[in-house]
């Protein structure tokens, strides 16, 4: 049978060849011709056998971390017969470990975040080194961790690489720390190899600082002309914390919050003082308010840092503004009857200087030839008014300070021209009608209606009559329909075109005004040859002919 011991070859041997051991058949008594052969991966290149003796040599430097064992096959042949002396057999050459690899931190870079003010013992991060050497070969891969940099704030557990806090840290003093960890193999014994890694430990912020005003007194000014909502200045508190822990809310103490307000700009963390109600220099020219500032987010466990809010005093000076005149009313509406004589009284407007010096006021009416205004604000007519031309005047009254003509105020003035009955009713249109020669008595010739340009307080009511002459001339008559219309009827039978081709009837129309006005209106009636039918409708053709200037026989 085969005779061999287990084969070991140390890695990283520097000699050209290293004797590993001997393969031998127990039939080989040294007095026969046995040839030993080596087969398999590495045979002839990494491992060489002296075929005469069975001695195996490693002729290459081996790296256990690259390959830790080689499985080879052995043969032995009797060269006298050419036959195998023993069955081919597999054997193993193990590469034994030396401590030729230092520990390496494979997960670099290491970065950890831990809240500031964390108590001692708080776990920060675990670093792990890896050693390529054989963990089963002595202490070659047994590691010990130690801290090279980072005392007294951090410590590392020697066997686990767990980094813990060993002293409280304040982010506001230093916000990040570089810790250097060393890993040594051979459990730190002489001849150990080492590797280091750097760990960046960042302190995250906790809300352990309250905001504090930069100034104990702020002086601001506001113009009395400033509208509500105007920003009149900013105040600023500072907070050593960062992010949402530095977000703050400004407010005014309750008693001072009538005229002013403070809103917080959450981007700049400034307090913006806002005008809540308009100020009047003449009424009150300075204010004092107290503002306070608090953090927006404060967890319960950190309330101890925020017991008393920081406050500041804000003195606000109101700046006097030369204000324009102020009318007593926002607008004026006056009434005046039409046809009143020039210089008639319309109404009085009044404006005053709100400033302390009480400048006299001058008035003017813009772009009006119809009205005048004097320095007392009295408005009079400068022309006669006709409601039927203009029933309303939309005007603008301007008040100007005498001592500062740039200070101007304008308000609307509405003047309504009231109606008087100064127009008689008249035909609503021009009437021209026709009567047939053979018309009978009582035949309706025309319906007429009237209009009146005057405005009626009640409804208009018109009265229709024939003039005295036409009443005496009995060819036509009128009937008032009592609905502001009337009808003209024939008052006889038969008309003669040759003798009397046209009738001009004067119609009187009276209104119901006080006093009543009457107008005379002429109705033209043509006599037509209507044929046998006797209907006025047949006059339409002749109306056309007549209107074209043809003479009909």
């Amino acid at each position: 049978g085969w005779v061999w011991n287990q084969f070991f070859v140390p890695e990283e041997m520097n000699t050209t060849s290293h004797h590993i051991g001997q393969l031998r058949s127990d039939l080989d008594n040294g007095n026969n011709s046995f040839q030993y052969k080596l087969l398999g991966a590495g045979a002839g290149s990494t491992f060489i056998i002296d075929e005469r003796t069975g001695d195996i040599y490693a002729i290459q430097k081996l790296d256990r971390e690259e390959r830790s064992l080689y499985i080879l096959r052995a043969q032995v042949i009797d060269i006298a017969t050419g036959r195998a002396v023993e069955p081919e057999s597999e054997f193993v050459i193990k590469v034994s470990d030396i401590n030729d690899n230092e520990p390496k931190f494979l997960d670099e870079p290491y970065e950890a975040i831990v809240p500031e003010m964390s108590p001692e013992g708080t776990l920060v991060i675990q670093v792990t080194a890896s050693d390529a050497d054989d963990p089963s070969s002595g202490n070659n891969a047994r590691l010990l961790y130690s801290l090279l940099q980072g005392q007294p704030y951090f410590s590392v557990e020697p066997t686990t690489g767990v980094i813990r806090i060993s002293s409280k840290m304040d982010r506001e003093l230093q916000d990040e720390y570089w810790v250097i960890i060393q890993a040594k193999d051979m459990i730190g014994q002489p001849g150990a190899l080492s590797g280091t890694t750097s760990v960046l430990i960042k302190l995250s912020d906790v809300n352990d600082n309250k905001p504090i005003f930069k100034e104990s007194l702020y002086r601001l000014t506001v113009s009395e002309s400033a509208p509500t909502g105007t920003s009149i200045g900013t105040i600023m508190a500072y907070d050593n914390d960062i992010g949402e822990n530095a977000e703050m809310d400004y407010s005014i103490e309750e008693d001072d919050s009538q005229t002013f307000d403070i809103i917080t700009n959450h981007e700049t963390q400034e307090g913006i003082v806002i005008l809540k109600k308009k100020v009047d220099f003449e009424h009150q020219n300075h204010y004092g308010i107290r503002a306070k500032v608090k953090n927006h987010h404060v967890p319960e466990q950190l309330m101890k840092y925020h017991t008393e809010a920081s406050t500041t005093f804000i003195k606000i000076q109101v700046e006097d503004v030369d204000e324009p005149p102020l009318f007593l009313l926002p607008y004026y509406v006056f009434e005046v009857f039409e046809e009143t004589p020039q210089g008639s009284f319309v109404g009085v407007v009044s404006a005053t200087d709100p400033d302390n010096r009480k400048s006299p006021i001058r008035y003017s009416i813009t772009r009006s030839k119809v009205f005048n205004i004097n320095d007392n604000g009295t408005i009079t007519t400068s022309n006669s008014l006709d409601r039927e031309i203009s029933a309303w005047y939309n005007l603008s009254i301007t008040a100007t300070e005498k001592y500062n003509i740039e200070q101007i105020s304008s308000i609307p003035l509405y003047v309504q021209v009231l109606n008087i009955n100064d127009h008689a009713p008249e035909f609503s249109q021009y009437y021209e009608t026709y009567v047939c020669e053979n018309a009978g008595s009582g035949q309706v010739i025309q319906t007429i209606s009237a209009v009146d340009r005057d405005e009626s307080i009640e409804e208009h009511h018109f009265y229709f009559n024939l003039s005295v002459e036409d009443t005496n001339n009995s060819s036509f008559t009128i009937i008032d329909n009592q609905d502001n219309t009337a009808v003209i009827l024939t008052n006889r039978t038969g008309f003669n075109l040759q003798e009397e081709p046209v009738f001009y009837i004067s119609i009187l129309i009276a209104d119901n005004g006080i006093p009543s006005l009457t107008s005379t209106n002429t109705l033209t009636i043509h006599v037509c040859d209507c044929g046998d039918s006797g209907s006025t409708q047949t006059c339409q053709y002749q109306e056309l002919v007549l209107s074209m200037g043809f003479k009909t026989e």
Epitope: T16, S17, H19, G30, N31, N32, S33, Q35, K37, I48, D50, E51, R52, T53, D55, Y57, I59, I79, A80
Partner: antibody, heavy 122, light 108 residues
Framework: QVQLQESGPGLVKPSETLSLTCTVS????????WSWIRQPPGKGLEWIGY???????NYNPSLKSRVTISVDTSKNQFSLKLSSVTAADTALYYC????????????????WGQGTMVTVSS | DIVLTQSPGTLSLSPGERATLSCRAS???????LAWYQQKPGQAPRLLIY???SRATGIPDRFSGSGSGTDFTLTISRLEPEDFAVYYC?????????FGQGTRLEMK
């Protein structure tokens, strides 16, 4: 072509160690077996032993206790040490290369050095 | 050890003649691992035949080897003047390698 050259002291005192070196030129020492052979004056040839380039050795049992053969592949040299010499070790010492006619087993010596004479005398 | 005995000890022949040298082993030489060498005065031995019958590189074909087991022969078919020297047989079939005591071939 490959040439062998023996070198070493020509005179060695009895009981001392004879040391010779064979330098291989014109080829590599690797993959061959290298032998030392001696020839006492007027006598025949005697094989002393061989070394394989990897360092494996085999010696003539008659000299085994006194012989050490070593190799230095980086210098392309191999050496012979024969301890406790006597006058009987006076001889012409040859280094020789085994041919590779028959791979792996012993083979004939196809290349020889010209030999170096070593005299053991006080 | 295998002992090789060469005969004759000295062989006197003239150029052009045929020379036959014998080598007998004390036990069978495995695989016919037997070689013949020529040595001239002041020179190192020169390989002539290996494997009992194979000529080494550059050896004239007048040299030939034969035999197996325990009996081996070196034949020089037609002697040339430069062939007169000492001839050694060597077995390398078993360790240790051994040489015969030599045959001196001299000119008659």
């Amino acid at each position: 072509q490959v040439q062998l050259q023996e070198s070493g002291p020509g005179l060695v005192k009895p009981s001392e160690t004879l040391s010779l070196t064979c330098t291989v030129s014109g080829g590599s020492i690797s993959s061959y077996y290298w032998s030392w052979i001696r020839q006492p004056p007027g006598k025949g040839l005697e094989w002393i032993g061989y070394i394989y380039y990897i360092g494996s050795t085999n010696y003539n049992p008659s000299l085994k206790s006194r012989v050490t053969i070593s190799v230095d592949t980086s210098k392309n040299q191999f050496s012979l040490k024969l301890s406790s010499v006597t006058a009987a070790d006076t001889a012409l010492y040859y280094c020789a290369r085994e041919s590779r006619y028959r791979s792996g087993w012993y083979d004939a010596f196809d290349i020889w050095g010209q030999g170096t004479m070593v005299t053991v005398s006080s | 050890d295998i002992v090789l005995t060469q005969s004759p000890g000295t062989l006197s022949l003239s150029p052009g003649e045929r020379a036959t040298l014998s080598c007998r082993a004390s036990q069978s030489v495995a695989g016919s691992y037997l070689a013949w060498y020529q040595q001239k005065p002041g020179q190192a031995p020169r390989l002539l035949i290996y494997g009992a019958s194979s000529r080494a590189t550059g050896i004239p074909d007048r040299f030939s080897g034969s035999g197996s087991g325990t009996d081996f022969t070196l034949t020089i078919s037609r002697l040339e003047p430069e062939d007169f020297a000492v001839y050694y047989c060597q077995q390398y079939g078993k360790s240790p390698i051994t040489f015969g005591q030599g045959t001196r071939l001299e000119m008659k």
